[in-house]
């Protein structure tokens, strides 16, 4: 008995060949002996089977002694033994129809799991092996799970179902939804305008959802919502925004926020969440703001930073083109009685300057003492 594997939703063509290369009478029946289709001269006739509206043949091949049964939009329950009766002969073909579906949707959030479930006819014992876009093979039984999806898992996954040494291949396009960066940090001098950008790492035709930026200022005891917004077909509309700070938001993707001024009271960490329509879970991006201020009060030159700095970061005060006068792994440094000239306050990580603020110290003219 010949075995043919089919894919749910696809079309299959079961072959039946007579020894005479001419149009003769034939019938296709199922295992219950119910007629599916046949011919009467050059006319196609159909029986009372449940395949009625999905079964067909190729009349153009009958003259060559070929009498195929074509079944469209295959269903798992179409799995059966089909019998072709021609020239007092019976040809049997066993059709096994398989389906492979993703747990929810093929658009998944970063960190979620992809579960592929194999639908198979009763009595079959298939094995399934999926190949990632980069060629990593994962084997499974009726279900196959891939955990902790990341952006780079996006692409075409090719799954092969093996049964009776025959195979059928499914291609599933997976899109992992995430922001391009999990976290970002912005370093600004006090008073500068701050730009926060949240680019997405995927493109889809229609993107609808809602989002919010929660902010935990270093100086504040609790976090607060700075802005909430809606996303409709890639258009951004602000729903609610705090009065302090008065954030502005771009109307188009990528999501873009502007803080008019970097101030010490705004330094801290934010979490932008984006809930997409018809998706469980949310996309997250962390954003951090570090603010620097250099001031001179009487005989004291001070440099301070606010916000989430690593303990390895170095804060230094130096006179231009000279060695650092003071350099500490702290959030504030100062110099008493600084020399006149252009002073630089530097925040650096392993020698790499992250933030720099210049302040000019004017000479102090002392009145000479008369003899």
């Amino acid at each position: 008995k010949k075995v043919v594997l089919g894919k749910k939703g696809d079309t299959v063509e079961l072959t039946c060949t007579a020894s005479q290369k001419k149009s003769i009478q034939f019938h296709w029946k199922n295992s219950n002996q119910i007629k599916i289709l046949g011919n009467q001269g050059s006319f196609l006739t159909k029986g009372p089977s449940k395949l009625n509206d999905r079964a067909d043949s190729r009349r153009s091949l009958w003259d060559q002694g070929n009498f195929p049964l074509i079944i469209k939009n295959l269903k798992i329950e179409d799995s059966d033994t089909y019998i072709c009766e021609v020239e007092d002969q019976k040809e049997e073909v066993q059709l096994l129809v398989f389906g492979l579906t993703a747990n929810s949707d093929t658009h998944l959030l970063q960190g979620q799991s992809l579960t592929l479930t194999l639908e198979s006819p009763p009595g079959s014992s298939p094995s399934v092996q999926c190949r990632s876009p980069r060629g990593k093979n994962i084997q499974g039984g009726k279900t196959l799970s891939v955990s902790q999806l990341e952006l780079q898992d996006s692409g075409t996954w090719t799954c092969t179902v093996l049964q009776n040494q025959k195979k059928v291949e499914f291609k599933i396009d997976i899109v992992v939804l995430a922001f391009q960066k999990a976290s970002s940090i912005v370093y600004k001098k006090e008073g500068e305008q701050v730009e926060f950008s949240f680019p997405l790492a995927f493109t889809v035709e229609k993107l609808t959802g809602s989002g919010e930026l929660w902010w935990q200022a270093e100086r504040a005891s609790s976090s607060k919502s700075w802005i909430t917004f809606d996303l409709k077909n890639k258009e951004v509309s602000v729903k609610r925004v705090t009065q302090d700070p008065k954030l502005q938001m771009g109307k188009k993707l990528p999501l873009h926020l502007t803080l008019p001024q970097a101030l010490p009271q705004y330094a801290g960490s934010g979490n932008l969440t984006l809930a997409l329509e018809a998706k469980t879970g949310k996309l997250h991006q962390e954003v951090n703001l570090v603010v620097m201020r250099a001031t001179q009060l009487q005989k004291n030159l001070t440099c301070e930073v606010w916000g989430p700095t690593s303990p390895k970061l170095m804060l230094s005060l130096k006179l231009e083109n000279k060695e650092a006068k003071v350099s500490k792994r702290e959030k504030a440094v100062w110099v008493l009685n600084p020399e006149a000239g252009m002073w630089q306050c530097l925040l650096s990580d392993s020698g790499q300057v992250l933030l720099e603020s210049n302040i000019k110290v004017l000479p102090t003219w002392s009145t000479p003492v008369q003899p």
Epitope: L114, S132, P133, R134, G135, K136, N137, I138, Q139, G140, L144, S145, V146, S147, Q148, L149, E150, L151, Q152, D153, G155, W157, A201
Partner: antibody, heavy 120, light 111 residues
Framework: EVKLQQSGTELMKPGASVKISCKAT????????IEWIKQRPGRGLEWIGE????????NYNEEFTGRATFTADTFSNTAYMQLSSLTSEDSAVYYC?????????????WGAGTTVTVSS | DIVMTQSPASLAVSLGQRATISCRAS??????????MHWYQQKPGQPPKFLIK???NLESGVPARFSGSGSGTDFTLNIHPVEEEDTATYYC?????????FGGGTKLEIK
């Protein structure tokens, strides 16, 4: 803390087989691939293959197909590599490593290595 | 298999200066979106340590003086400014296909 603890040094005869273990702690063992990597003295690193403990899925470098066999015990959170028909070319440090990627290969946590010496 | 070629084989850099290590793949290991290239550091008697994934993404806990760049077939690992503790052998590795392969390594010495 994620850790991979490997079995100790092995001194083997040519033609013999060696089985190295790698015990994982600090994460869900069944969900992440365990990779096996070879490093010969003064030489570079060579990927042998991998196993996904939850499903038993394996992928091998063709160079090692037929000689390397990976298994995993999800009760003890331990992965094993057996290498057969040993020759002096197999004298090396063998590392197990974790790959957090579902469809890719990069290795974020490594065991300390198991030294295998093949000598008659 | 994709062959990864690292240069130079060894490198001596003064403390505080920049170290540049190159890695060339025998075929492109990038799509329009990502480069499937990763970097590791190995100190004598220790296993390799993961530094950078997908050409430029620093693994958490890795100092900002390490940076990666490149696409297609040519990739670079930069360390600036180098510190005493950076004395090690550095390896690149592609994950474009099976089998993933490593470069021969670049030994960095601090003067």
């Amino acid at each position: 803390e994620v850790k991979l603890q490997q079995s100790g040094t092995e001194l083997m005869k040519p033609g013999a087989s060696v089985k190295i273990s790698c015990k994982a702690t600090g994460y869900t063992f069944s969900s992440y691939w365990i990779e096996w990597i070879k490093q010969r003295p003064g030489r570079g690193l060579e990927w042998i293959g991998e196993i996904l403990p939850g499903s038993g899925s394996t992928n091998y470098n063709e160079e090692f197909t037929g000689r390397a066999t990976f298994t995993a015990d999800t009760f003890s959170n331990t992965a094993y590599m057996q290498l057969s028909s040993l020759t002096s070319e197999d004298s090396a440090v063998y590392y197990c490593a974790r790959s957090v990627s579902a469809s890719n290969w990069y290795f974020d946590v490594w065991g300390a290595g198991t030294t295998v010496t093949v000598s008659s | 298999d994709i062959v990864m070629t690292q240069s130079p084989a060894s490198l001596a850099v003064s403390l505080g200066q920049r170290a540049t290590i190159s890695c060339r793949a025998s075929q492109s290991v990038s799509t329009s979106s990502y480069s499937y290239m990763h970097w590791y550091q190995q100190k004598p008697g220790q296993p390799p340590k993961f530094l950078i994934k997908y050409a430029s993404n620093l693994e958490s806990g890795v100092p900002a003086r390490f940076s990666g760049s490149g696409s297609g077939t040519d990739f670079t690992l930069n360390i600036h400014p180098v510190e005493e503790e950076d004395t090690a052998t550095y390896y690149c590795q592609h994950s474009w296909e099976i089998p993933p392969t490593f470069g021969g390594g670049t030994k960095l010495e601090i003067k």
